[in-house]
């Protein structure tokens, strides 16, 4: 099995990842490996010859580049966070700060916007993941509820007037929680909608 | 080469804020990270956070949200880090360091005592 | 937070020996780990970065190797110089974490 440099009459190489074409020479030569880049083109006689990414820097793939690409910070004005540095071998990876949704993508995600309230009785959806999408409102299921706007905040379950010793004054609806009170005591008119204890 | 100055000792009182700087040289300010790491007595390293001093930007631990604040002057290449709400259990070494890799590049570190 | 469990804590050699540290990391970091070299009153320095890459200027006898998530810093023959404190860090991920160190003292 032949080690490169080879000569390749019909412009393939065996190893499309780790050798390229070089159509000068009609040869295939090695793809140089991440965290490299050439800094001696191949010949008929001689292979690439790579060095390492200096700082700052990084090439992600086998790579056939004479320069690595420039570490980028993720832009805090576009409403991203760094999850993880770069290195030699990767990008900065970036993803949507808390309370934000990914709104513009192009290979990855380069724009973020706020995710939208969910109202009272209503709570978002979970996803597999997070800051892939905008907030999608779905109604607190029986027996919960929810009484902000907030895009974040999620269904309680009703209290259980009896586990406190108390009795049942108003039942729970989806936007509101469940009112006790003290089983000796009537209800005033005005205290409803709250626990009284 | 590249340096890293940092400030002097300082000692505080638990609830007072101390803020200690870090003067580069020797590589170009804007474009490295400088990240926080202290060293409390007989405890593990700690990352604290890090600035990009080409915006300015600041990434916490979440351990230390709320009380700790890094910040950075273009105009003479200096880090800082504030921590607010002093208690015992902050002190410690602090150091300012520079990343690539893991940090090849360390300030000489700065000693926090809180003590009443 | 990705922990990194370091082993031993301390151990006792001899001028001349091989010592080998292990470093476990909780989840997955790739090769994003770096090594350091502690003296009493001094910052750390920087041995090895992306797991097996000797820093600048340090001696062959410091090697790593590993991936994932095991991790193991070799000294082939222990110098006098070499009597430290050793860390292991990861930065694959944010917050970089830290092993709780080895102590390598004089049998």
């Known amino acids: 099995q032949a080690v490169p440099p080879y000569a390749s009459e019909n412009q393939t190489c065996r190893d499309q990842e780790k050798e390229y074409y070089e159509p000068q020479h009609r040869i295939c030569c090695s793809r140089c490996p991440p965290g490299t880049y050439v800094s001696a083109k191949c010949s008929r006689i001689r292979d690439t010859v790579c060095a390492t990414c200096a700082e700052n820097s990084y090439n992600e793939h086998w790579n056939y580049l004479t320069i690595c690409q420039l570490c980028r910070p993720c832009d805090p004005v576009m409403g991203l966070e760094e999850i993880a540095p770069c290195t030699s071998k990767r990008k900065t990876q970036c993803r949507c700060q808390p309370g934000m949704f990914c709104a513009a993508w192009a290979l990855e995600c380069t724009h973020c916007e706020l995710l939208s309230d969910c109202p009272p009785g209503t709570e978002a959806e979970l996803k597999d993941e997070v800051g892939k999408g905008n907030n999608h409102c779905v109604p607190c299921k029986a027996g919960h509820f929810q009484n902000t706007s907030s895009p974040s905040a999620r269904c309680q379950p009703h209290t259980r007037c009896e586990n406190q010793g108390l009795v049942e004054a108003a039942p729970g609806t989806a936007q509101s929680d469940t009112t006790c009170k003290n089983p000796l005591e009537p209800l005033p008119p005005e205290m409803s909608g709250t626990m009284l204890m | 080469q590249v340096q890293l100055v940092q400030s002097g000792a300082e000692v505080k009182k638990p609830g007072e804020s101390v803020k200690v700087s870090c003067k580069a040289s020797?590589?170009?300010?804007?474009?490295?990270?400088l990240h926080w790491v202290r060293q409390a007595p007989g405890q593990c390293l700690e990352w604290m956070g890090w600035?990009?001093?080409?915006?300015?930007?600041?990434q916490y631990n979440e351990k230390f949200k709320g009380r700790v604040t890094i910040t950075a002057d273009k105009s003479t290449s200096t880090a800082y880090m504030e921590l607010s709400s002093l208690r015992s259990e902050d002190t410690a070494v602090y150091y300012c360091?520079?990343?690539?890799?893991?940090?090849?590049?360390w300030g000489q570190g700065t000693t926090v005592t809180v003590s009443s | 937070d990705i922990q990194m469990t370091q082993s031993p804590s301390s151990l006792s050699a001899s001028v001349g020996d091989r010592v080998t540290i292990t470093c476990k990391a909780s989840?997955?970091?790739?090769?994003?780990v770096a090594w350091y070299q502690q003296k009493p009153g001094k910052a750390p320095k920087l041995l090895i970065s992306?797991?097996?890459y000797r820093y600048s200027g340090v001696p062959s006898r410091f090697s790593g190797s590993g991936s994932g998530t095991d991790f193991t810093l070799t000294i082939s023959s222990l110098q006098p110089e070499d009597f430290a404190t050793y860390f292991c860090?990861?930065?694959?991920?944010?917050?970089?974490?830290f092993g709780c160190g080895t102590k390598v003292e004089i049998k």
């Open positions: 020797g590589y170009t300010f804007t474009t490295y990270y």
């Open positions: 989840q997955n970091v790739g090769i994003n």
């Open positions: 992306s797991a097996s």
């Open positions: 360091a520079r990343s690539w890799e893991g940090f090849p590049y």
């Open positions: 860090q990861q930065y694959d991920t944010y917050p970089f974490t």
């Open positions: 600035i990009y001093p080409g915006n300015v930007h600041a």
